[in-house]
Each structure stands twice: as C-alpha cells, then as structure tokens.
Amino acid sequence: QRLPRMQEDSPLGGGSSGEDDPLGEEDLPSEEDSPREEDPPGEEDLPGEEDLPGEEDLPEVKPKSEEEGSLKLEDLPTVEAPGDPQEPQNNAHRDKEGDDQSHWRYGGDPPWPRVSPACAGRFQSPVDIRPQLAAFCPALRPLELLGFQLPPLPELRLRNNGHSVQLTLPPGLEMALGPGREYRALQLHLHWGAAGRPGSEHTVEGHRFPAEIHVVHLSTAFARVDEALGRPGGLAVLAAFLEEGPEENSAYEQLLSRLEEIAEEGSETQVPGLDISALLPSDFSRYFQYEGSLTTPPCAQGVIWTVFNQTVMLSAKQLHTLSDTLWGPGDSRLQLNFRATQPLNGRVIEASFPAGVDSSPRAAEPVQLNSCLAAGD
C-alpha cells in the first residue's frame, strides 16, 4: 500500500524544502516580453517562441571565484539586458573527428532538430510556468512515493555523462500520479547554471531558479524505456527547483560531496543508497503538471511533467559545488546545461492547487482563466 508523503515528514538535514508558495509570488514579465536582439538561427527559432535570444554561450574554461551568489526572485531585474541572455544556445555539437549527428551538446552546431527531428515538435519541454494561467484541477491528488528510502547497500552509480550528473536508481521505487497512473523511478539528474547565473530548465513567470532536479520515471505499462518513448504518459518526470538557503542540505551533500571524484566527463563512482525523497520538496500536494518532452535529444514527446510548487533549499556553497566541479566536452566546464524554454502552443498547464487565485497579491480580483481537464483523460 502506498502512503502519500506527509507535510510534517521533513527531509534530511532539518528540512530541505523551501517556501510553501514560492512560485508566482513576484509579478515579473515573461521572457517573451524581452527584446530579441542578436538572435542567431537555432532550434529556438520556432513560431511562438517564448524565450530569450539563444546566444552561443558556452561555459568558460577558467576557474571561477568563490564569490558565487544565487539569484533570488526579489533580486531579479524585471527585464533582462538584451545583450546578456541567460540561455546558452539550444543546439547540438558535431564532433570534430566525424559527422556523427548524435554527438549533441549545449551550444554549437548543428541544431537539435538535425540530431533528432522530434526536437522541433510542437509540445516540447521545458516551458515557462505562469501560475495565473494554470488550470486548477482538484482531481490532481498528492503524489504517492513508495520505496524511495534506500538502504546504503547496494550502492548506486553516480556518473558525469558529459551533459549532467546522473544517479541511476535501483528497481523498486514506485510513484503514482494518481489512481492507475503508476510509474517506476529510473534515474535522477540535475541542471544548473554558472557563477551568478541561474540554470533551472523550467521558469516561473520568466524567473529562472539556480538549479533543477529531475527524477525520471517509466510507466508500469511498459517494460523498457525504448517501448515508452513518444507514447503519451510513457515517461513521467518529477521536477523541483533548487534555491539558495542558509543551511547545508544534508541529503544533497551525500551526492555533492562525491562530485570531485567524477569531475572528468564519463567518469563514475559508487555512492551509498540514500533517501531519494529527501531530495524533493516535502509538499507532495501542490504542483503543476503538463505534457511535454524530454529536454535533451531525442526530445521524445508524451512525457508527463510534474513541477513542484515548493522549492528545495541548498546552501550557497552547495550550489557553487554543483555548478563549479564537473567538466564536460572539450575541456569546458559542465555549466549552463539547460534547454531554452519552449512555446506552449496551446497547451494548458494544470495545477493541483488554486495557483492563479492566491499566488499574485497584486491582482485585485484574480480570475482562473483556464478550466481543468479531468485527470487521466
């Protein structure tokens, strides 16, 4: 029997979760309101693009200073300077030694749709979340996780795969989005920025968070990922934003403390099993949900995205460790490993709580603009 995560069930380290309602509290303009100067051709040049210019913005090779400060929502300027976009170009990389189109990376050529045509699909991820436009769906019940508290043995593989750090999860981690919507966790990985530059994939009203965790799941209706790719609901990802807080997050420290061992691209190490649920926010009842895609090639669609309303707090030092330890291809730092936000193209993001009603204190009479489709339809 699955038990929903309780509010008072605080994660390791005195609570890794952030504010209860951090999303949608600031009335910042969306990135689509920003000027679009110096926009090179690339995957993000699609009709209805909602993102900033995708300048070729590879991470710097030289070491960074220790004085990294994560941006807070209230510290953000209302409009990004046109010449200084936060996005790296949303392209792939053609390996110099050959013409292998599957050798993609963040920044460079060729565009991702040339690597995988699905990357030019109409229902891609990540997206910008606008709480006031989300459809409140009371049918979206608290997420249920079972078996996420892993014993130290067997150990888990932690790998620098050149575009993220990935923890491969063992069998037995079960997650339910609702009745009859059951999944098994496969792996988790992170996306981050660089010094003073946030790197979450999803944004909220144009605001980009310091980092983001993705826990990838396979529907129990499928035995293997290759069978589920591109099938509606075949894969599901739980996503949470990581923010700077005053204390060290001990759950994350179990992974971050091992990053130096896998600094080199392709390297891996074994880490003791840990409480995977402690890496997520404690409130499993408040979240946004929509259907999108994988955020890296092959960009297969049909992925159910669940983005927590509550954030997870890491110390400034931990966020610095995340963004400043790993190396990627071509002797460059593994940084800014996020895809540009993609157009919704008519999709409606659903919310398990009335996000549009109570999350914007500036609106005199807030109105829920979109209605909910029955969960599971």
């Epitope: 795969n161 290759d226 291809p329």
Partner: nanobody
Framework: EVQLLESGGGLVQPGGSRRLSCAAS???????????VAWYRQAPGKQRELVAV???????KYSDSVKGRFTISRDSSKNTVYLQMNSLRAEDTAVYYC????????WGQGTQVTVSS
C-alpha cells in the same frame, strides 16, 4: 525492444590484440545513439568493473588498468560501439559486457576474452 549483442571475444595470446563490438538491434527510436555506452568486465570471483565509456558528446574515459592500451569508439550509423584492445595481458581475462545508459540500463549477455599462451 532494444537488445545489445557483444561479439569479438575469444582466446588471444599475451601482447595480442582483439576488437570487441557491441551492436544494438530492435531500436525503433534509436536510443542507442543518445546513450552513454560503456564496457564493463568481470573476472571470476571478482566484482564487475568499468573498463571504458563513451558519452553522447564523444568523450571517452578509461580505467587506469587499460589506459593507453584500450580504445573505445562508436559508429552511430551502425548502432555499434567498439572496444579495441591492444597489448593484452593475462589479467585482462574476463567476461566483457556492453552497457547502454539511456534513462535506464541496457546490458548485453557478455563475451568471454581469455588471454593465455
């Protein structure tokens, strides 16, 4: 359904060479192209150990014990990853397994390499 098939194993003399192949079949969405692919090996009575890995960016990484002797490469047009093994030693004797890591692990059945005179 994706299946990995290793080949190229066999008996080889010390100092000799061998090339292992790992071919993916039944790959409708071609996830093999987007997987980090690794060769692991397991000698009798020992734990499985990482030999070499090639990432989706073409980056390669080798265990210290094979560095300078083994080379991993991939040909995505053939859905195949190779492990070129030179200057083989008796301690390289093991069953060699191919692993493709794309959201989940895919494993081959293994191919035996025996280095002996």
């Amino acid at each position: 359904e994706v299946q990995l098939l290793e080949s190229g194993g066999g008996l080889v003399q010390p100092g000799g060479s061998r090339r292992l192949s790992c071919a993916a079949s039944g790959n409708s969405v071609n996830i093999f192209s987007f997987a980090a692919v690794a060769w692991y090996r397991q000698a009798p009575g020992k734990q499985r150990e990482l030999v070499a890995v090639i990432t989706t960016t073409g980056g390669t990484k080798y265990s210290d014990s094979v560095k300078g002797r083994f080379t991993i490469s991939r040909d995505s047009s053939k859905n195949t990853v190779y492990l070129q093994m030179n200057s083989l030693r008796a301690e390289d004797t093991a069953v060699y397994y191919c692993n493709a890591d794309y959201l989940q692990d895919y494993w081959g059945q293994g191919t035996q390499v025996t280095v002996s005179s």
